[in-house]
């Protein structure tokens, strides 16, 4: 049997918020006496911070939940829960186990556009021509759900000319065009984008919106018969 | 360039206490975490504690008792305190900082080390 | 506590040769919500502070030669240096950051011949 488990909670989360389970075996018979059922308890918790009781275990679950408020990932990001087993439910021989309780940074920053006001130029009849890069702050873990960012168009591009993906380091939106643009036709789109995670914001967030205003370049096209 | 960089007392009397700074240069105390880590002479390295970006610590359970880490982020000073020294605390104590402040990180893992500074205990 | 085994205490090679050393946990290293095992590998020459070379037992940390491979996974793992140089000469540690304490082997002492 595993004598150190690992699991994970987000910070901030309500007392009742279950985080793992650890299970103890025991070979004895627990249908017809008591000696082979197991009953949990919290023998310890490091560090005790901000008290020595954020955790509860479920004394013949093993589920280990979170009974306090305070959670703060910055201040300690992980615990250390030192767990009794003890079998005929609680009254016989005790063996001890190890669980460690990463604290998860929650989405709770939303990205932001710095700038939120754009202008570009495109050659008419580009495909897959880089527009803009957008750019994005985050306060939330570098690299994490919580930071990487979506971006969705929202409007102006009634005619499906533009797309924008997530460059995977950087974290900016890569605006490209999906298919080429004809000058005569339009010579000025003006797009709107929202940003947002790709974790859920923990709590309600504003969303922040970058307008690009996107200009045509007329391109000298043959004569057609 | 990151720096990180012990000053001790060299010298401690059996029963009494020893105190380290750790002053580092590079990074911010906000951003990683720093570990203390000793190395008695001609042995391995033994892991003492951790402080966290927001001032939250682990320490070892062994020494817990009589250790104390703290920090001040202003002056990017990280200190540790241990009280009733014995013999076999003689060692090369490091400070060494975490690879980042996330598990994704590899936060365990410590990647600049000071010098260390070499505590002697007898009497 | 988790307990690290290191093998063998010493080992002398001659330059240019391949070298494998081991690092044995009392438990596996592996989460499996990650997928990912909490062991790194420093390396110690003679009068200095250790150096990290290795994290999540097999990302070599930037900087650290190309010869340096960690491998292995749960509680068996292996630093391999594929064509050692003088400059080699030192003690490697593993290291566990999987449970408190964390905890280190005893090291692996490489002589050069």
């Known amino acids: 049997t595993q004598d150190t488990f690992r699991g994970s909670v987000l910070e901030g989360v309500l007392p009742g918020t279950s985080v793992m389970q650890v299970t103890a075996t025991d070979e004895d018979d627990a249908i017809y006496t008591y000696n082979g059922v197991v009953a949990y308890s919290i023998h310890s918790q490091e560090p005790k911070d901000p008290h020595d009781l954020m955790f509860t275990i479920h004394r013949s679950t093993g589920t280990i939940s979170v009974i306090s408020s305070g959670l703060d990932r910055e201040k300690v990001p992980e615990y250390t829960l030192t767990i009794q087993a003890t079998d005929m439910d609680g009254d016989g021989s005790t063996t001890t186990a190890v669980a460690v309780v990463e604290i998860l940074d929650a989405n709770d920053n939303a990205p932001m556009f710095d700038p939120q006001k754009y202008e570009a130029h495109v050659p008419e009849n580009a495909v897959g021509h880089e527009v803009q890069r957008l750019t994005v702050t985050d306060l939330d873990a570098p690299n994490s759900p919580a930071w990487r960012a979506t971006y969705l168009i929202m409007g102006g591009d009634d005619g499906d000319h533009f797309t924008i993906t997530t460059h995977p380091e950087s974290n900016q939106g890569i605006l490209t065009t999906r298919k080429g643009l004809d000058f005569e036709a339009k010579n000025q789109h003006t797009l709107y984008v929202e940003v947002t995670n790709e974790a859920p914001f923990v709590l309600k967030l504003p969303t922040s919106t970058a307008t690009i205003v996107v200009h045509v370049e007329d391109v000298n096209e043959a004569p057609v018969f | 360039v990151q720096l990180v960089e012990e000053s001790g007392p060299g010298l401690v009397a059996p029963s009494q206490s020893l105190s380290i700074t750790c002053t580092v240069s590079g990074f911010s105390l906000t951003s990683y975490p720093i570990n203390w880590v000793r190395q008695p002479p001609g042995k391995g390295l033994e892991w003492l504690g951790v402080?966290?970006?927001?001032?939250?610590?682990n320490y070892d359970s062994a020494l817990k008792s009589r250790l104390t880490i703290s920090k001040d982020n202003s002056k990017s000073q990280v200190f540790l305190k241990m009280n009733s020294l014995q013999t076999d605390d003689t060692a090369r104590y490091y400070c060494?900082?975490?690879?980042?402040?996330?598990?994704?990180?590899?936060?365990?893992?410590?990647?600049?080390w000071g010098q260390g500074t070499t505590v002697t205990v007898s009497s | 506590e988790l307990v690290m085994t290191q093998s063998p205490s010493s080992l002398a090679v001659s330059v240019g040769e391949k070298v494998t050393m081991s690092c044995k946990s009392s438990?596996?290293?592996?989460?499996?919500?990650?997928?990912?095992?909490?062991l790194a590998w420093y390396q110690q020459k003679p009068g200095q502070s250790p150096k990290l070379l290795i994290y999540?037992?097999?990302t070599r940390e930037s900087g650290v030669p190309d010869r340096f491979t960690g491998s292995g996974s749960g509680t068996d793992f292996t630093l391999t240096i594929s064509s050692v140089k003088a400059e080699d000469l030192a003690v490697y540690y593993c290291q566990q950051y999987y449970s408190y304490p964390y905890t280190f082997g005893g090291g692996t002492k490489l002589e050069i011949k």
């Open positions: 999540w037992a097999s």
């Open positions: 402080i966290w970006t927001g001032g939250g610590t």
């Open positions: 060494a900082r975490s690879r980042g402040a996330y598990d994704f990180d590899g936060r365990g893992a410590m990647d600049y």
């Open positions: 438990q596996s290293l592996l989460y499996s919500s990650n997928q990912k095992n909490y």
